[in-house]
């Protein structure tokens, strides 16, 4: 896997040892956690991520609250099980034999169980929007302008295809960005959306996961765009399998 | 610029059926949970039926058997199927988008029912 050849480091991913210890001497990285190699030319999984942050100190875990509405990731930190491609397994149970489903960016999607519970597949999330409050500025940002610049930022700094930025709505002071990537339409080497996500929520937290950058200036025109409030919904392909009590609760 | 416009309405007599329709633009449509209320004159506004991101449906009791709301979210649009429409549902019919979690709520101006002999 590439990276940094002069000082071997992993440009998009910080939460890595890297060793030039490759074929040929070449550097490779390999995430906390979980030590798995990963590709430093592009995001690393969300699973990874989240396993290698679970790994480090003083992590505290907030719940997700499920609901039969989008889901909501409320940064529901656990320490998940991955593939062996970075992905995160259907299943995922803690240290008390407590299981539940997720889908494909890590959020649960049933109620819990216990370790007879069966998740048949990784059921994908082929639609996320990303609602953000901008801090007061003296007028509205030029609608044009902002949508220019997040496509930009995603498809440059994210890696993320263009065709997968499907909309950017704005109405002062909420900024919704909605990407949309279905299975067919996510070829080898696209950037999951689900990862471009979880990037942009953590460098919005001002908690970059990038190697050396430095935090995220989103700037509309030159006026800065500083976000007081994130929250991201997710849909999935098949809908979530809640009981009607939990719905109801 | 956020905006739900509502379609359909109109003079309807006793068991007839109108199909309402409740076009949204500015928002992402699809995350939303979708609601129809209706107003009678003197009267408070009260939920027909809602729909959730995934489809689920809700109805009012006085209404179950009779409407049926549906989503396209290719369309951006709400429907409200109304049959065996009676006097009582005479009334000025308003869409309603509510994003769970994000205190987003939006109105649509309303469209009249009216059914009459």
């Known amino acids: 896997h590439t990276a940094a050849q002069d000082n071997c480091t992993c440009p998009t991913n910080k939460m890595t040892v890297c060793s030039p210890d490759g074929p040929g001497g070449r550097c490779q990285c390999r995430a906390l956690g979980s030590g798995m190699a990963v590709d430093c030319s592009t995001l690393t999984s969300k699973c990874l991520l989240l396993k290698a942050r679970m790994s480090a100190p003083k992590n505290a875990r907030t719940l997700v609250r499920p609901s039969e509405h989008a889901l909501v990731d409320n940064d529901g930190l656990y320490d998940p099980d991955c593939d062996p491609e970075g992905r995160f397994k259907a299943r995922q149970c803690n240290q008390t034999s407590v299981c539940w489903c997720v889908n494909s960016v890590g959020v649960r999607r049933t109620d819990k169980g216990d370790l007879s519970l069966r998740c048949d597949e990784l059921v994908r999330t082929h639609h996320i929007l990303i609602d953000l409050r901008h801090r007061p500025t003296a007028g509205a940002f030029n609608h044009s302008d902002l949508d220019a610049e997040l496509r930009r930022l995603f498809r440059e700094r994210y890696r993320l295809h263009p065709k997968f930025v499907a909309a950017v709505h704005y109405e002062q002071p909420t900024i919704q960005i909605e990407l949309r990537q279905n299975t067919s339409q996510k070829a080898a080497g696209d950037v999951d959306i689900g990862d471009a996500a979880y990037y942009f929520e953590r460098d919005i937290k001002g908690e970059s996961l990038f190697q050396g950058r430095g935090g995220l200036d989103l700037r509309v025109r030159g006026e800065p765009l500083q976000v007081e409030r994130t929250l991201i919904y997710y849909l999935d392909e098949i809908p979530p399998k809640f009981s009607m009590k939990r719905l109801t609760a | 610029q956020v905006q739900l416009q509502e379609s359909g309405g109109g003079l309807v007599q006793p068991g007839g059926s109108l199909r309402l329709s409740c076009a949204a633009s500015?928002?992402?449509?699809?995350?939303?949970?979708m609601a129809w209320y209706r107003q009678a004159p003197g009267k408070q506004r009260d939920m027909v039926a809602t729909i959730t991101a995934y489809g689920n449906t809700n109805y009012a009791d006085s209404v179950k058997g009779r409407f049926t709301t549906s989503r396209d979210n290719a369309k951006n649009t709400v429907y409200l199927q109304m049959n065996s429409l009676k006097p009582e549902d005479t009334a000025v019919y308003v869409c309603?988008?509510?994003?769970?979690?994000?205190?987003?709520?939006?109105w649509g101006q309303g469209t009249q029912v009216t059914v009459s002999s």
């Open positions: 309603n988008a509510n994003l769970p979690s994000a205190s987003h709520n939006y």
């Open positions: 500015g928002f992402a449509f699809s995350f939303y949970a």
